[in-house]
């Protein structure tokens, strides 16, 4: 419940300044506090609107101040109301003229249902008139003028809730402005009972605390706190947690405190009288000085706090031995908590002596709902209450309050909870490319609905027609490749964003569907690439017999090694060759092929070939004659690639012999790079020529090489490396 306090200073109005201050003590932001005239209690009071101002000394307080000259307009009943969402708390009070003919014994009087009650007014002015008593502005009783006693009483032998109200007394010739008021509050239940059926037993409220008939909680008088009101506040403080302070020179002197029903109004501890300006007599303390100190062991009696017990003693009269009580403290609770919508288990941790119990720790939501712990444990020094909010949502954001109320006192700690909306992508991911077993995806994680920052992203995928769970991969980039997919399968894709904090996984975003390609056929077998002319190459392969009924074709890709020139050719599947034309002479080409249906097949290995040359071949280079014996010698050479060299010719003759007496050795495999001449004469000089042939003609040797064989007895020279034809 909201801690609302109305300070009436002073209820008896003379020609001094007087005021009403309404304080919403503590932590919760409220709808505006209102102060108004209580026409329910007194219908015929002054109608003037009140000038309500903000109390600058307090965050949540409103004030009405009447200057001396307005004194005549003040008489009447007033209320202060505070609201928290569904809950409205109204505190009532009255103001009356100090010069009234009668004065009430007390401003309010709280009784239990069934009590024997006397409402009394003290006669302060003697007049030769009848006395009249009204309830809520309606006449109920009169006393003939010669019978008006010093104490005018209304007797209710068996008080009922309907007896509650504002009772006023005056002489018959008087009016509202000479009336005295007192308010009777009748608890809905009999003494010490509470609950809808009044069948629960109240906690024993000490120091004149009052048991609330709806909640069973003690409403503590100003200056006391805790579950049983046993704990005295520090000097001149008040409020449910003793956080508010009386700023007067003499503390709370002249402040009448009015609290929610059924408490009513009283002085702060240490003060008494209708104006709360009289100090307690020795031996008395508490609100209205109604409590008597009966301190054991000669302990001191303080009019504000009661018995001041020595260490090791406790209780109202210091009658119990035991460890000194310690006001609870809330620990380890941050001022601000960011929570993801979903399940939430807030924790309140508190110290104190005695340690707070399960029932003494609560959590108050911003809408005023009071939660009780779902789980509870304690160590030697701390109690820990764990609350469960099955589903916290953004409207639950705001100031929450951990509240601990023990016999040793009460403490409240406000903290701010910010409930975040889990992120969800607005768009489905896009499929950039697919194969039979992979897909390239743009996850399109932005824009998204909800709160960031995004901690991680998951790409979820599953086959559409399988009752499989969603699989996922963590992704860091917007572009991601999904591998190991099934061919010719429809998949669903979506993206889930994860924000920081527990339970930060957002809803998956919109779903995209795509289908993987079928598995491709193997490449054609027996591929062969040969030059056909200076501008054509011929590619051949074995006939293809596909296993399915699907139409198919052969795709041939050719590209030039020397130039950036590529072409893809589609060949009907029933053919077994293709002529690649419009090529450049003397150029090397790389060719590969695959068999495609609706799905693309696998590429073959690369094949390379040169188109035929358009010029004579260059002369073989690096010609060497070695390993010469008496009857043989090895000739080696190198040739340049790309001139369509089909054969090498070695021509030799004995030096000095005629040209027509030469021997030609034609080597038709152009990859052979050395040859052994045999059957030579010993100790003979030979002239050797070597030249290359291609489709255009032969190369022209620039000069001849000489070879002299050895005498028959000599060993041969070393042989060079390379392919050799014997």
């Amino acid at each position: 419940a909201m801690d609302l306090i109305l300070i009436n200073s002073l209820p008896l109005v003379s020609d001094a300044e007087t005021s009403l201050t309404c304080i919403a003590s503590g932590w919760r932001p409220h709808e505006p506090i209102t102060i108004g005239r209580d026409f329910e209690a007194l219908m015929n009071q002054h109608q003037d609107p009140l000038e309500v101002t903000q109390d600058v000394t307090r965050e949540w307080a409103k004030k009405v101040v009447w200057k001396r000259e307005k004194a005549s307009k003040i008489n009447g009943a007033y209320f202060c109301e505070g609201r928290v969402r569904g809950e409205a708390i109204r505190i009532r009070t009255m103001k009356m003229r100090q010069q009234a003919s009668f004065l009430p014994a007390t401003l309010t009087m709280t009784v239990d249902k069934g009590d024997n009650v006397n409402i009394s007014f003290k006669k302060v002015l003697i007049k030769e008139e009848d006395a009249v008593i009204y309830k809520n502005g309606s006449f109920i009783h009169s006393v003939p003028r010669h019978e008006v006693p010093d104490i005018l009483e209304v007797h209710l032998p068996h008080a009922q809730p309907q007896d509650a109200g504002v009772y006023s007394a005056r002489y018959i010739g008087g009016n509202l402005f000479t009336s005295a008021f007192t308010r009777l509050i009748v608890r809905r239940c009999e003494a010490q009972k509470w609950g809808p059926e009044c069948n629960h037993l109240c906690t024993a409220c000490m120091n004149n605390g009052v048991c609330h008939e709806d909640t069973g909680e003690c409403i503590c008088p100003p200056g006391f706190m805790g579950r049983t009101c046993e704990k005295a506040c520090e000097l001149h403080t008040f409020g449910r947690t003793c956080k508010e302070r009386c700023s007067g020179q003499e503390g709370c002197k002249s402040y009448v405190f009015c609290l929610p029903d059924p408490y009513g109004c009283s002085c702060a501890t240490g003060w008494k009288g209708l104006q709360c300006n009289e100090a307690c007599h020795p031996g008395f303390y508490g609100p209205d000085c109604k409590l008597r100190c009966s301190c054991n062991n000669g302990e001191m009696c303080d009019r504000f706090q009661g018995c001041l017990c020595s260490p090791g003693w406790q209780g109202l009269q210091c009658e119990r031995e035991g460890i000194q009580r310690m006001t609870p403290k809330i620990v380890d609770l941050p001022d601000h908590i960011e929570v993801n919508s979903g399940k939430f288990n807030p924790i309140c941790k508190a110290s104190g002596w005695p340690l707070p119990t399960n029932e003494e720790m609560t959590l108050v939501k911003p809408d005023g709902t009071v939660l009780h712990p779902k789980d509870f444990n304690h160590t030697d020094h701390f109690s820990v209450a764990i609350f469960t909010i099955h589903r916290i949502l953004p409207p639950d954001s705001g100031v929450w309050v951990c509240s601990v109320n023990t016999v040793a006192g009460m403490v409240e700690k406000p903290f701010n909870i910010s409930v975040k909306v889990l992120p969800k992508p607005l768009n489905a991911p896009n499929v950039i490319d697919t194969g039979h077993n992979f897909a390239v995806i743009n996850i399109s994680s932005e824009p998204y609905f909800g709160d960031g920052p995004i901690k991680s992203k998951k790409l979820l995928y599953k086959p559409v027609n399988h009752y499989e769970a969603w699989q996922h991969i963590q992704v860091t980039n917007e572009i991601v490749t999904l591998n190991y997919l099934e061919p010719r399968t429809e998949y669903e894709l979506c993206v889930q964003l994860v924000r920081r904090g527990e339970g930060g996984e957002g809803h998956p975003g919109p779903v995209r569907r795509f289908t993987t390609a079928s598995i491709g056929l193997p490449p054609p077998r027996g591929l062969n690439l040969l030059p056909k002319s200076q501008t054509t190459l011929n590619l051949t392969w074995q006939p293809i017999f596909p296993s399915s009924e699907d139409d198919f074709y052969v795709e041939v890709e050719r590209r030039s090694v020397q130039k950036s020139d590529q072409q893809n050719i589609k060949v009907p599947g029933n053919l077994t060759s293709v002529l690649l034309n419009n090529l450049h002479p003397r150029e090397q080409y790389v060719v590969r092929a695959r068999v495609n249906t609706k799905a693309q097949g696998e590429w073959s290995e690369d094949l390379t070939a040169w188109t035929l040359s358009d010029i004579l071949p260059p002369q073989p280079e690096n010609i060497k004659i070695s390993n010469i014996t008496h009857s043989s010698a090895v000739i080696s050479w190198t040739i340049l690639d790309g001139y369509s060299i089909s054969s090498i010719t070695i021509r030799y003759k004995v030096q000095g012999k005629n040209e027509d007496q030469h021997v030609d050795v034609k080597i038709k495999n152009a990859t052979i790079t050395q040859y052994q001449l045999k059957g030579l004469e010993p100790e003979t000089a030979y002239q050797v020529d070597i030249f290359a042939e291609n489709n255009i003609g032969s190369s022209n040797p620039a000069f001849s090489h000489e070879l002299v064989t050895l005498p028959e007895s000599q060993a041969p020279a070393d042989l060079g490396g390379g392919k050799m034809l014997l």
Epitope: V84, R85, G86, D367, K374, H390, R391, L393, H507
Partner: antibody, heavy 121, light 107 residues
Framework: QVQLVESGGGLVQPGGSLRLSCAAS????????MSWVRQAPGKGLEWVSA????????YYADSVKGRFTISRDNSKNTLYLQMNSLRAEDTAVYYC??????????????WGQGTLITVSS | DIQMTQSPSTLSASVGDRVTITCRAS??????LAWYQQKPGKAPKFLIY???TLESGVPSRFSGSGTGTEFTLTISSLQPDDFATYYC?????????FGQGTRLEIK
Amino acid sequence: QVQLVESGGGLVQPGGSLRLSCAASGFTFSSYAMSWVRQAPGKGLEWVSAISGSGGSTYYADSVKGRFTISRDNSKNTLYLQMNSLRAEDTAVYYCARGVDSSMVTGFDHWGQGTLITVSS
Amino acid sequence: DIQMTQSPSTLSASVGDRVTITCRASQSISRWLAWYQQKPGKAPKFLIYEASTLESGVPSRFSGSGTGTEFTLTISSLQPDDFATYYCQQYEDYPLTFGQGTRLEIK
């Protein structure tokens, strides 16, 4: 143990009004969100309205918005449903149901026995 | 509004059978789903919340699974007491909505 007892059902003419009550016991009433759920004869369940533990927040199904008002009195541990402008299609058993906790959007872990409302001329 | 669709509408089974009831949401509801059992003339009984968490006191033969839009309630070995109507309910957002119910009858 948790108990929810509905009352206030009966026969009412179209256009008439009725107020249902649900008396709760066995738990801290003010700490729980509460709902009304109805079930037309031979039909499925239909959520009608919900209210937060403090009474500060309320929600309604479109079919009853503007006609029904949910409220609670935490001092009496009682939930109410004020039904105005009743129609034949409002005929149903009305259940009072407790939310799993203070959360406004939850399942219902405890239900009353239901009270029948018949709207007919 | 989020639509909840249960299948099948009626299910015939025998004591000892394993049965599965499916509930589909028209949009993702994460894990915010509850299951109830209702017998004729009685109030619904809370079985499962958060799609898979068993309410205390509910026999372990009942189990729930699913997330997003597809959910299932499974009874591993049917007992005579299990023949009733079962409802799913989403609590992702207002208005709270129930499935149309699945009647589980004796074969």
